[in-house]
């Protein structure tokens, strides 16, 4: 053997080296790669040193047993069935409260004849439930209301008002609360003629008492 | 009707572990989580983890992570959960809980808990 | 992980007033939950998704707020009403519950 160069490199099982043919002078970088399926263990890349050793020693190729790590998804929690996903794994997806999954909840790390191990989906999405509408309510008679839209969205508060001569009695802003169905806070309120509250508001109200119902009456009841 | 029964008191010394059950019974274990929340004496809940009984699979606070271990078996609808490196402040009532359905996020139905206790 | 800032932390009050206790979020979330609680006992589900009744939860008990902001009303309160009442939310995860309202007997 030349006493000038590092010594030949061999191939290695389930994988290649390249360059195929490299020159074994100083400073010489060879990189090893693996075919589908397997994954290096140790250094792929060795280097022809001035003492004329490699600077690591051969590596391997490994069989790949297990998925890569699927990830977090923002808005949710996992469940995890084994720590270091295996073939046979699974991973489940459970969106956080007020926001709902697309794409698949459970995830499966399947084994596959050429190649590494693969998760049976894509991790999914959870995305912000979208909550419904309230319906517009019609304005008080004498009265209007503000905005005056058909559907108003959850959160949106509306106001009522009355024509002049007219009081408001109830919310003058009700509420669109969230949730499912979104509702309004409050009933609508109701205009009523100024003139009037004020007449019954300085009248107190006397009662006679009623004689005894007869039971005729109490049957007509 | 729903039930959740826990297994007895316990008392260890820092540094142990332990190990809690809750026995499931008046509906079908595998489909529905089981969920573990403590409460230390005169203190609020703090929620621990969980445990899919159908597929075997944990998810746990972060803050628990390392030291918690969330198994089942299934043939006798039964959980566990076991603490490791018991500390004094691990010292609580340790509950087993269930949501009302799959997909919700309230704990409606709750076992009597489990008093573990960590002294020298 | 979302804080639960319960108020009152006591709520000294008679039978047959009403009750009002609050619960504020760090961030905004998108229900709340409610617990009663008892000595020695586990905590009991009182409310759930902000006004939700459980069946068997009597209708003086009444849940309602939004955003960072709930309440809890005990309309007419009764003997058996004075526990330690929580929160609960978990629209991020870990879950996190409030620490408490202590409503005690004037």
């Known amino acids: 053997p030349r006493n000038d160069t590092c010594p030949e490199l061999p191939e290695i099982p389930n994988g290649w080296k390249s360059p195929s043919q490299p020159e074994l002078v100083h400073g010489t970088v060879v990189t090893y790669q693996c075919y589908p399926g397997y994954q290096v263990v140790g250094s792929s890349v060795l280097m022809c040193q001035w003492d004329l050793t490699w600077s690591e020693d051969l590596p391997s190729c490994q069989r790949v047993t297990s998925c890569h790590d699927p990830g977090d998804v923002e808005h949710s929690r996992r469940l995890i069935s084994s720590p270091k996903f295996p073939v046979g794994a699974t991973v489940q997806y459970i969106c956080d409260q007020g926001f709902v999954l697309m794409g698949s909840s459970i995830l499966t790390c399947h084994d596959r004849q050429a190649g590494s191990p693969k998760w049976s989906d894509r991790a999914p999405k959870c995305l912000l439930e979208q909550l419904k509408p309230c319906h517009g309510l019609s304005a008080p008679e004498n009265g209007a209301r503000s905005p005056e839209k058909q559907l108003h969205p959850a959160g949106a508060t509306i106001h009522f008002s009355c024509a002049p001569g007219y009081v408001l009695k109830g919310q003058a802003s009700i509420k669109c609360v969230p949730g499912h169905p979104s509702h309004w806070s409050d009933p609508p309120p109701i205009c009523r003629a100024a003139s009037l509250d004020g007449f019954y508001n300085s009248r107190s109200l006397d009662v006679a008492k009623a004689p005894a119902a007869s039971s005729t009456l109490d049957a007509a009841h | 009707q729903v039930q959740l029964v826990q297994s007895g008191a316990e008392v260890k010394k820092p540094g142990a572990s332990v190990k809690v059950s809750c026995k499931a019974s008046?509906?079908?274990?595998?489909?529905?989580?089981m969920h573990w929340v403590r409460q230390a004496p005169g203190q609020g809940l703090e929620w621990m983890g969980e445990?899919?009984?159908?597929?075997?699979?944990?998810g746990y606070n972060q803050k628990f992570k390392g030291r918690v271990t969330m198994t089942r078996d299934t043939s006798i609808s039964t959980a566990y959960m076991e603490l490791s490196r018991l500390r004094s402040d691990d010292t609580a009532v340790y509950y087993c809980?269930?949501?009302?359905?799959?997909?919700?996020?309230?704990?409606?139905?709750w076992g009597q808990g489990t008093l573990v206790t960590v002294s020298s | 992980e979302i804080v639960l800032t319960q108020s009152p932390a006591t709520l000294s009050l008679s039978p047959g007033e009403r009750a009002t206790l609050s619960c504020s979020a760090s961030s905004s979330v998108s229900y709340m939950h409610w617990y009663q609680q008892k000595p020695g006992q586990a905590p009991r589900l009182l409310i759930y998704d902000t006004s939700k009744l459980p069946s068997g939860i009597p209708a003086r008990f009444s849940g309602s707020g939004s955003g960072t902001d709930f309440t809890l009303t005990i309309s007419s309160l009764e003997p058996e009403d004075f526990a330690v009442y929580y929160c609960?939310?978990?629209?991020?995860?870990?879950?996190?519950f409030g620490q408490g309202t202590k409503l005690e007997i004037k």
């Open positions: 008046g509906y079908t274990f595998t489909d529905y989580n």
């Open positions: 445990i899919n009984p159908n597929i075997g699979g944990t």
């Open positions: 809980a269930r949501t009302y359905s799959y997909y919700s996020y309230e704990f409606a139905y």
């Open positions: 609960q939310q978990w629209s991020s995860t870990p879950p996190t």
